[in-house]
């Protein structure tokens, strides 16, 4: 069991570092802040954010070729439950510095617990998404 | 008030087998995984296995699979373990207990518990 | 031996703070929830606290419980003599596909 313990890590290790999780994170931001938008935020208001979506993709033509892109690479971690966690962890760290406040970050967690499913995937059981923003350790 | 309450504990002799049963009662026992947690005597907890609200899905710890049976009968609010081939390391409370997990992204935890009934396997 | 490792005991005075470690690996801790669970002598285990930091009703703040990657923390201030007990970790395993324990650590009130 130990020995493909071993190789599974080393499979999903590999896997995350092919995957390109950019699309994903892109998908969510420009959702979140789609919904931000429609509370009353002026959508053209500037922003420092490299994320930050155009008026092109506020009217959704961009987002939806960002969640096209994120679902064929989530696609690839459909058959390791575990693997799609650690996806999934990963997005949520890598943007955990760009939430602005807890809200944003409350917002960013629900949309991204949605992924999976949006995709027509299944969620990963009991995947714990409450990541710091001190960065996790990588086995 | 949720109750959990453990029979069918007994000593039995290595190689016998031996069916636990678990009432439960104050709180909608299909909406909930349940668990069965042993503990040798003297010493730590044992998770011995997991079934699903509607029985569709059960895990086992590895020294047990194949020997014990977790099932559920939601109609009368019964937890069962059937454990059969059993051997000195089976020894210990068994403890039922309702376990909180939900969805995808919560954890298994363990909010009620029985008072736990004594297996003690023996020649 | 148990895959969660929790130091076998820990003291401090009445009042003062004791924190209990709880040490995994990717797999379980570091994916997954962790929960903590309080057993009193010749009594059943009681929840302390879910999913990493999340207090049960009628469990005083006084208990708490942080994650950080692969590892776990219970803290417990304002310590009393009724604290004295058994203390245990437990989270999924996916490798595994199972629920560990770790193997306890046993708080004395001084």
């Known amino acids: 069991r130990q020995q493909w313990e071993l190789q599974g890590d080393r499979r999903c290790q590999s896997q995350l570092e092919r995957a390109n999780l950019r699309p994903c994170e892109q998908h969510l931001m420009q959702k979140i802040q789609r919904d931000e938008d429609s509370y009353g935020r002026d959508p053209y208001s500037p922003s420092q954010d490299p994320y930050s979506p155009s008026p092109y993709d506020r009217r959704g033509a961009g987002s939806s070729q960002h969640q096209e892109r994120c679902c064929n690479e989530l696609n690839e971690f459909e058959n390791n439950q575990r693997c799609m966690c650690e996806a999934l962890q990963q997005i949520m760290e890598n943007q955990s510095d760009r939430l602005q406040g807890r809200q944003q970050e409350q917002q960013f967690k629900r949309e991204l617990r949605n992924l999976p499913q949006q995709c027509g995937l299944r969620a990963p059981q009991r995947c714990d998404l409450e990541v710091e923003s001190g960065g996790r350790d990588r086995y | 008030e949720v109750q959990l309450v453990e029979s069918g504990g007994a000593l039995v002799q290595p190689g016998g087998s031996l069916r636990l049963s678990c009432a439960a009662s104050g709180f909608k026992f299909s909406t909930f995984y349940m668990t069965w947690i042993r503990q040798a005597p003297g010493k730590g907890l044992e998770w011995v296995a997991n079934?699903?609200?509607?029985?569709?899905?059960?895990d086992y710890l590895d020294s047990v699979r194949g020997r014990f049976n977790i099932s559920r009968d939601n109609a009368k609010s019964v937890l069962y373990l059937q454990m059969n081939t059993l051997s000195a390391d089976d020894t210990g409370v068994y403890y039922c207990t309702r376990n909180g997990l939900q969805d995808s992204y919560s954890g298994d935890f363990f909010d009620h518990w029985g008072q736990g009934i004594l297996v003690t396997v023996s020649s | 031996q148990s895959v969660l490792t929790q130091p076998p005991s820990v003291s401090a005075a009445p009042g003062q703070k004791v924190t209990i470690s709880c040490s995994g690996t990717g797999s379980n801790i570091g994916h997954n929830y962790v929960s903590w669970y309080q057993q009193l002598p010749g009594t059943a285990p009681k929840l302390l606290i879910f999913d990493n930091t999340k207090r049960p009703s009628g469990i005083p703040d006084r208990f708490s419980g942080s994650k950080s990657g692969s590892s776990a923390t219970l803290g417990i201030t304002g310590l009393q003599t009724g604290d004295e007990a058994d203390y245990f970790c437990a989270t999924w395993d996916a490798d595994l596909s199972a629920v560990l324990f770790g193997g306890g650590t046993k708080l004395t009130v001084l």
């Open positions: 079934i699903k609200q509607d029985g569709s899905e059960k």
